[in-house]
Protein backbone atom coordinates (compact mmCIF):
# COMPACT_ATOMS: atom_id res chain seq x y z
CA UNK A 1 0.00 0.00 0.00
CA UNK A 2 1.26 3.53 -0.69
CA UNK A 3 2.43 5.59 2.26
CA UNK A 4 2.24 9.27 3.07
CA UNK A 5 5.76 10.73 3.20
CA UNK A 6 7.35 14.14 3.55
CA UNK A 7 10.81 15.66 3.26
CA UNK A 8 12.17 17.48 6.27
CA UNK A 9 15.14 18.46 8.36
CA UNK A 10 15.37 17.97 12.12
CA UNK A 11 17.13 20.14 14.68
CA UNK A 12 17.47 19.36 18.35
CA UNK A 13 16.06 21.74 20.95
CA UNK A 14 19.47 23.45 21.17
CA UNK A 15 19.23 24.15 17.43
CA UNK A 16 21.93 21.66 16.47
CA UNK A 17 21.54 20.27 12.96
CA UNK A 18 22.03 16.65 11.97
CA UNK A 19 24.72 15.77 9.41
CA UNK A 20 26.33 12.62 8.09
CA UNK A 21 29.43 11.43 9.92
CA UNK A 22 30.85 8.66 7.78
CA UNK A 23 28.59 6.37 5.77
CA UNK A 24 26.45 4.98 8.62
CA UNK A 25 26.37 7.58 11.37
CA UNK A 26 24.76 10.93 12.09
CA UNK A 27 26.17 13.64 14.30
CA UNK A 28 24.70 16.85 15.72
CA UNK A 29 26.35 20.25 15.52
CA UNK A 30 25.53 23.92 15.12
CA UNK A 31 25.52 25.06 11.49
CA UNK A 32 25.18 28.53 10.00
CA UNK A 33 24.83 30.07 6.56
CA UNK A 34 25.92 27.93 3.64
CA UNK A 35 26.97 25.12 5.98
CA UNK A 36 23.24 24.50 6.55
CA UNK A 37 23.27 22.69 3.21
CA UNK A 38 25.20 19.88 4.90
CA UNK A 39 22.25 18.92 7.07
CA UNK A 40 20.58 15.62 6.38
CA UNK A 41 17.20 15.65 4.65
CA UNK A 42 14.90 12.96 6.00
CA UNK A 43 12.05 11.26 4.22
CA UNK A 44 9.58 10.74 7.05
CA UNK A 45 6.84 8.20 6.30
CA UNK A 46 3.59 7.43 8.10
CA UNK A 47 3.64 3.69 8.74
CA UNK A 48 1.68 1.03 10.56
CA UNK A 49 2.31 0.79 14.29
CA UNK A 50 0.86 -0.30 17.59
CA UNK A 51 -2.06 1.53 19.15
CA UNK A 52 -1.17 4.34 21.50
CA UNK A 53 -3.11 7.45 22.30
CA UNK A 54 -1.29 10.30 20.57
CA UNK A 55 1.82 8.62 19.24
CA UNK A 56 2.12 8.46 15.46
CA UNK A 57 4.28 5.69 13.97
CA UNK A 58 6.83 6.90 11.44
CA UNK A 59 9.93 5.67 9.64
CA UNK A 60 12.90 7.97 9.08
CA UNK A 61 14.80 7.42 5.86
CA UNK A 62 17.51 9.58 4.36
CA UNK A 63 16.14 11.28 1.27
CA UNK A 64 17.30 9.69 -1.99
CA UNK A 65 19.48 7.23 -0.07
CA UNK A 66 18.52 3.67 0.70
CA UNK A 67 19.26 4.21 4.39
CA UNK A 68 16.81 4.14 7.30
CA UNK A 69 17.29 4.78 10.98
CA UNK A 70 16.78 1.52 12.85
CA UNK A 71 17.01 0.28 16.43
CA UNK A 72 18.83 -2.96 17.25
CA UNK A 73 20.50 -4.59 20.22
CA UNK A 74 24.29 -4.28 20.20
CA UNK A 75 26.14 -5.75 23.15
CA UNK A 76 22.77 -6.07 24.90
CA UNK A 77 22.08 -2.33 24.54
CA UNK A 78 19.43 -0.70 22.32
CA UNK A 79 21.38 1.09 19.62
CA UNK A 80 20.54 3.50 16.80
CA UNK A 81 22.01 2.72 13.41
CA UNK A 82 21.64 3.58 9.75
CA UNK A 83 20.62 0.48 7.86
CA UNK A 84 20.72 -0.14 4.11
CA UNK A 85 17.50 -1.37 2.49
CA UNK A 86 16.40 -2.41 -0.97
CA UNK A 87 14.99 0.84 -2.45
CA UNK A 88 12.48 -1.16 -4.51
CA UNK A 89 10.71 -2.26 -1.32
CA UNK A 90 10.93 0.83 0.90
CA UNK A 91 9.19 2.78 2.24
CA UNK A 92 6.23 0.50 2.88
CA UNK A 93 3.20 0.69 5.13
CA UNK A 94 4.23 -2.31 7.21
CA UNK A 95 7.81 -1.49 8.10
CA UNK A 96 9.74 -3.91 10.28
CA UNK A 97 9.52 -2.85 13.90
CA UNK A 98 13.19 -1.87 14.18
CA UNK A 99 12.52 0.93 11.66
CA UNK A 100 9.46 2.32 13.45
CA UNK A 101 9.52 5.33 15.76
CA UNK A 102 6.57 6.68 17.70
CA UNK A 103 6.48 10.39 16.92
CA UNK A 104 5.24 12.35 19.92
CA UNK A 105 4.42 16.05 19.41
CA UNK A 106 4.07 18.37 22.38
CA UNK A 107 4.09 22.16 21.95
CA UNK A 108 5.75 21.99 18.52
CA UNK A 109 8.52 19.77 19.88
CA UNK A 110 8.94 16.25 18.51
CA UNK A 111 10.23 13.16 20.25
CA UNK A 112 10.98 9.89 18.47
CA UNK A 113 10.53 6.84 20.66
CA UNK A 114 11.73 3.49 19.39
CA UNK A 115 8.81 1.13 18.79
CA UNK A 116 11.19 -1.79 19.28
CA UNK A 117 12.50 -0.45 22.60
CA UNK A 118 9.82 1.58 24.44
CA UNK A 119 11.15 4.55 26.44
CA UNK A 120 14.28 4.74 24.30
CA UNK A 121 14.50 7.91 22.22
CA UNK A 122 16.51 9.36 19.38
CA UNK A 123 18.91 11.60 21.30
CA UNK A 124 21.76 14.06 20.93
CA UNK A 125 24.44 15.10 23.39
CA UNK A 126 24.83 18.59 24.82
CA UNK A 127 28.34 18.55 23.37
CA UNK A 128 29.04 19.58 19.79
CA UNK A 129 29.88 17.15 17.00
CA UNK A 130 28.78 14.01 18.85
CA UNK A 131 26.87 11.04 17.34
CA UNK A 132 23.10 10.90 17.32
CA UNK A 133 22.18 7.90 19.48
CA UNK A 134 19.37 5.98 21.16
CA UNK A 135 19.03 7.13 24.76
CA UNK A 136 17.09 5.55 27.60
CA UNK A 137 16.49 8.73 29.61
CA UNK A 138 14.25 11.72 29.05
CA UNK A 139 14.62 15.07 30.76
CA UNK A 140 18.24 14.48 31.71
CA UNK A 141 21.43 15.85 30.19
CA UNK A 142 20.83 14.35 26.77
CA UNK A 143 18.45 16.01 24.32
CA UNK A 144 15.38 14.14 23.07
CA UNK A 145 13.33 17.09 21.72
CA UNK A 146 13.50 18.12 18.07
CA UNK A 147 11.90 20.62 15.74
CA UNK A 148 11.01 19.80 12.16
CA UNK A 149 11.10 21.97 9.06
CA UNK A 150 9.76 20.96 5.66
CA UNK A 151 12.29 21.02 2.86
CA UNK A 152 11.26 22.72 -0.37
CA UNK A 153 12.37 20.78 -3.42
Amino acid sequence: APVRSLNCTLRDSQQKSLVMSGPYELKALHLQGQDMEQQVVFSMSFVQGEESNDKIPVALGLKEKNLYLSCVLKDDKPTLQLESVDPKNYPKKKMEKRFVFNKIEINNKLEFESAQFPNWYISTSQAENMPVFLGGTKGGQDITDFTMQFVSS
Epitope: A1, P2, V3, R4, S5, L6, N7, C8, M44, F46, E51, N53, D54, I56, V58, K93, K103, E105, N108, L110, T147, M148, Q149, F150, V151, S152, S153
Partner: antibody
Framework: EVQLVESGGGLVQPGGSLRLSCTVS????????MSWVRQAPGKGLEWIGI???????YYASWAKGRFTISKDTSKNTLYLQMNSLRAEDTAVYFC?????????????WGQGTTVTVSS | DIVMTQSPSTLSASVGDRVTITCQAS??????LSWYQQKPGKAPKLLIY???TLASGVPSRFSGSGSGAEFTLTISSLQPDDFATYYC??????????FGQGTKLEIK
Protein backbone atom coordinates in the same frame (compact mmCIF):
# COMPACT_ATOMS: atom_id res chain seq x y z
CA GLU B 1 -3.59 32.98 17.79
CA VAL B 2 -4.05 30.60 14.87
CA GLN B 3 -5.91 32.22 11.96
CA LEU B 4 -6.67 31.03 8.44
CA VAL B 5 -8.32 33.28 5.86
CA GLU B 6 -9.42 32.02 2.44
CA SER B 7 -9.90 34.25 -0.58
CA GLY B 8 -10.28 34.05 -4.34
CA GLY B 9 -13.73 32.52 -4.61
CA GLY B 10 -16.35 33.80 -7.01
CA LEU B 11 -18.36 33.03 -10.11
CA VAL B 12 -16.60 31.12 -12.88
CA GLN B 13 -17.86 29.60 -16.12
CA PRO B 14 -17.80 25.84 -16.74
CA GLY B 15 -14.41 24.84 -18.12
CA GLY B 16 -12.76 27.82 -16.46
CA SER B 17 -10.03 27.99 -13.84
CA LEU B 18 -9.70 29.60 -10.44
CA ARG B 19 -6.95 29.89 -7.83
CA LEU B 20 -7.93 30.07 -4.19
CA SER B 21 -5.61 31.41 -1.50
CA CYS B 22 -5.42 30.77 2.23
CA THR B 23 -3.30 33.14 4.28
CA VAL B 24 -2.31 31.89 7.72
CA SER B 25 -0.98 33.51 10.87
CA UNK B 26 -0.02 32.28 14.33
CA UNK B 27 1.95 29.34 12.92
CA UNK B 28 4.31 28.53 10.06
CA UNK B 29 3.62 26.60 6.89
CA UNK B 30 7.19 25.31 7.17
CA UNK B 31 6.17 22.90 9.92
CA UNK B 32 2.43 22.27 9.53
CA UNK B 33 0.62 20.32 6.83
CA MET B 34 -2.43 21.92 5.24
CA SER B 35 -5.54 20.47 3.62
CA TRP B 36 -8.28 21.80 1.40
CA VAL B 37 -11.82 20.58 2.11
CA ARG B 38 -14.99 21.55 0.26
CA GLN B 39 -18.71 21.47 0.96
CA ALA B 40 -21.32 21.63 -1.78
CA PRO B 41 -24.59 23.43 -0.88
CA GLY B 42 -26.57 21.29 1.56
CA LYS B 43 -24.01 18.48 1.36
CA GLY B 44 -21.27 17.00 3.52
CA LEU B 45 -17.54 17.65 3.82
CA GLU B 46 -15.28 16.39 1.03
CA TRP B 47 -11.49 16.21 1.43
CA ILE B 48 -9.56 17.46 -1.61
CA GLY B 49 -5.92 16.99 -0.66
CA ILE B 50 -3.03 17.79 1.66
CA UNK B 51 0.43 19.34 1.30
CA UNK B 52 3.47 18.76 3.49
CA UNK B 53 6.61 20.02 1.75
CA UNK B 54 6.18 21.30 -1.78
CA UNK B 55 7.08 17.90 -3.25
CA UNK B 56 4.76 15.92 -0.97
CA UNK B 57 1.14 16.45 -1.88
CA TYR B 58 -1.65 13.88 -1.71
CA TYR B 59 -5.09 14.11 -3.30
CA ALA B 60 -8.46 12.42 -3.15
CA SER B 61 -8.72 10.14 -6.19
CA TRP B 62 -11.44 12.30 -7.77
CA ALA B 63 -9.31 15.48 -7.43
CA LYS B 64 -6.14 14.22 -9.12
CA GLY B 65 -5.37 16.01 -12.37
CA ARG B 66 -7.75 18.97 -12.04
CA PHE B 67 -6.76 20.28 -8.60
CA THR B 68 -3.26 21.32 -7.50
CA ILE B 69 -2.23 22.35 -4.01
CA SER B 70 0.85 24.51 -3.50
CA LYS B 71 2.19 26.98 -0.98
CA ASP B 72 4.54 29.92 -0.56
CA THR B 73 6.02 29.58 2.91
CA SER B 74 7.60 33.03 2.78
CA LYS B 75 4.14 34.56 2.27
CA ASN B 76 2.41 32.20 4.74
CA THR B 77 0.01 31.38 1.93
CA LEU B 78 -1.54 28.13 0.71
CA TYR B 79 -3.09 27.82 -2.76
CA LEU B 80 -5.61 25.64 -4.55
CA GLN B 81 -5.49 25.76 -8.34
CA MET B 82 -8.69 24.43 -9.89
CA ASN B 83 -8.93 23.73 -13.62
CA SER B 84 -11.66 22.50 -16.00
CA LEU B 85 -14.30 23.51 -13.49
CA ARG B 86 -17.75 21.91 -13.57
CA ALA B 87 -21.11 22.79 -12.06
CA GLU B 88 -20.57 20.08 -9.43
CA ASP B 89 -17.48 21.94 -8.17
CA THR B 90 -19.80 24.64 -6.79
CA ALA B 91 -19.06 24.64 -3.06
CA VAL B 92 -17.61 26.44 -0.08
CA TYR B 93 -13.87 25.73 0.01
CA PHE B 94 -12.10 25.56 3.37
CA CYS B 95 -8.40 25.41 4.18
CA UNK B 96 -7.51 23.53 7.34
CA UNK B 97 -4.40 22.82 9.40
CA UNK B 98 -3.39 19.28 10.29
CA UNK B 99 -3.15 19.11 14.08
CA UNK B 100 0.11 17.15 14.04
CA UNK B 101 2.22 15.71 11.26
CA UNK B 102 0.40 12.64 9.90
CA UNK B 103 -2.39 12.94 12.48
CA UNK B 104 -4.85 13.49 9.61
CA UNK B 105 -7.25 15.48 11.81
CA UNK B 106 -7.65 19.23 11.46
CA UNK B 107 -7.63 21.59 14.41
CA UNK B 108 -7.74 24.95 12.64
CA TRP B 109 -10.09 26.00 9.84
CA GLY B 110 -10.70 29.07 7.74
CA GLN B 111 -14.16 30.57 7.34
CA GLY B 112 -14.44 29.30 3.76
CA THR B 113 -14.67 30.95 0.35
CA THR B 114 -17.55 30.29 -2.03
CA VAL B 115 -16.98 29.08 -5.59
CA THR B 116 -19.91 29.07 -8.02
CA VAL B 117 -19.51 27.38 -11.40
CA SER B 118 -22.27 28.49 -13.73
CA SER B 119 -22.79 29.93 -17.18
CA ASP C 1 -10.56 4.14 -1.14
CA ILE C 2 -11.95 3.66 2.36
CA VAL C 3 -15.62 4.66 2.66
CA MET C 4 -17.02 6.06 5.91
CA THR C 5 -20.73 5.49 6.61
CA GLN C 6 -22.56 7.31 9.39
CA SER C 7 -25.89 6.43 10.94
CA PRO C 8 -28.42 7.77 11.39
CA SER C 9 -28.44 10.54 8.79
CA THR C 10 -30.79 12.59 10.95
CA LEU C 11 -31.40 12.29 14.67
CA SER C 12 -34.16 14.05 16.61
CA ALA C 13 -33.55 14.49 20.33
CA SER C 14 -34.34 16.73 23.27
CA VAL C 15 -32.17 18.72 25.68
CA GLY C 16 -30.88 16.37 28.37
CA ASP C 17 -31.04 13.26 26.16
CA ARG C 18 -28.15 10.86 25.73
CA VAL C 19 -27.45 10.42 22.03
CA THR C 20 -25.14 8.14 20.05
CA ILE C 21 -23.96 8.46 16.46
CA THR C 22 -22.27 5.56 14.70
CA CYS C 23 -19.56 5.58 12.06
CA GLN C 24 -18.48 2.51 10.10
CA ALA C 25 -15.37 2.23 7.95
CA SER C 26 -15.32 -0.05 4.91
CA UNK C 27 -12.12 -1.62 6.31
CA UNK C 28 -10.13 -1.42 9.54
CA UNK C 29 -8.63 1.99 10.27
CA UNK C 30 -7.32 1.07 13.72
CA UNK C 31 -8.13 4.08 15.95
CA UNK C 32 -7.43 6.70 13.27
CA LEU C 33 -10.82 8.37 13.51
CA SER C 34 -11.90 11.92 14.34
CA TRP C 35 -15.25 13.59 14.96
CA TYR C 36 -16.23 17.15 14.01
CA GLN C 37 -19.15 19.41 14.80
CA GLN C 38 -20.41 21.90 12.23
CA LYS C 39 -23.05 24.59 12.61
CA PRO C 40 -24.78 26.22 9.61
CA GLY C 41 -22.56 28.75 7.84
CA LYS C 42 -19.55 27.93 10.01
CA ALA C 43 -16.38 25.91 9.65
CA PRO C 44 -16.19 22.45 11.24
CA LYS C 45 -14.74 22.16 14.74
CA LEU C 46 -12.59 19.23 15.86
CA LEU C 47 -14.20 17.40 18.79
CA ILE C 48 -12.40 14.08 19.15
CA TYR C 49 -9.28 12.54 17.63
CA UNK C 50 -7.73 9.08 17.70
CA UNK C 51 -11.26 7.73 18.30
CA UNK C 52 -11.50 8.74 21.95
CA THR C 53 -9.28 11.74 22.81
CA LEU C 54 -11.14 14.98 23.48
CA ALA C 55 -9.78 17.99 21.59
CA SER C 56 -8.80 21.07 23.56
CA GLY C 57 -11.75 22.97 25.01
CA VAL C 58 -14.38 20.35 24.18
CA PRO C 59 -16.89 19.67 26.99
CA SER C 60 -16.62 16.31 28.75
CA ARG C 61 -20.21 15.38 27.81
CA PHE C 62 -18.75 14.40 24.42
CA SER C 63 -17.01 11.03 24.22
CA GLY C 64 -15.80 8.73 21.48
CA SER C 65 -15.16 5.02 21.40
CA GLY C 66 -14.37 2.17 19.03
CA SER C 67 -11.52 0.81 16.97
CA GLY C 68 -11.07 -1.17 13.79
CA ALA C 69 -14.11 -0.38 11.67
CA GLU C 70 -16.86 0.56 14.20
CA PHE C 71 -16.92 3.85 16.07
CA THR C 72 -19.38 5.86 18.14
CA LEU C 73 -19.76 9.45 19.26
CA THR C 74 -21.83 9.89 22.42
CA ILE C 75 -23.22 13.07 23.95
CA SER C 76 -24.16 12.20 27.52
CA SER C 77 -26.64 15.00 28.13
CA LEU C 78 -27.62 17.17 25.16
CA GLN C 79 -27.29 20.92 25.57
CA PRO C 80 -28.97 23.54 23.35
CA ASP C 81 -25.59 24.36 21.81
CA ASP C 82 -25.12 20.76 20.61
CA PHE C 83 -27.72 20.82 17.85
CA ALA C 84 -25.54 20.71 14.74
CA THR C 85 -24.23 18.33 12.09
CA TYR C 86 -21.57 15.81 13.11
CA TYR C 87 -18.99 14.21 10.82
CA CYS C 88 -16.60 11.33 11.34
CA UNK C 89 -13.30 11.31 9.48
CA UNK C 90 -10.82 8.57 8.68
CA UNK C 91 -7.44 10.11 9.40
CA UNK C 92 -5.00 7.29 8.83
CA UNK C 93 -6.22 4.64 6.44
CA UNK C 94 -3.59 4.98 3.76
CA UNK C 95 -3.15 7.97 1.47
CA UNK C 96 -6.73 9.21 1.45
CA UNK C 97 -8.51 11.09 4.21
CA UNK C 98 -12.29 10.62 4.07
CA PHE C 99 -15.33 12.06 5.85
CA GLY C 100 -18.61 10.37 6.61
CA GLN C 101 -21.73 11.84 5.03
CA GLY C 102 -22.77 13.57 8.26
CA THR C 103 -25.46 13.21 10.92
CA LYS C 104 -27.81 16.12 11.51
CA LEU C 105 -28.81 16.38 15.17
CA GLU C 106 -32.05 18.34 15.42
CA ILE C 107 -34.45 19.34 18.17
CA LYS C 108 -37.35 16.93 18.64
Amino acid sequence: EVQLVESGGGLVQPGGSLRLSCTVSGFSLSSYAMSWVRQAPGKGLEWIGIIYDSASTYYASWAKGRFTISKDTSKNTLYLQMNSLRAEDTAVYFCARERQIFSGDMDGWGQGTTVTVSS
Amino acid sequence: DIVMTQSPSTLSASVGDRVTITCQASQSISSYLSWYQQKPGKAPKLLIYRASTLASGVPSRFSGSGSGAEFTLTISSLQPDDFATYYCQNTGGGINIAFGQGTKLEIK
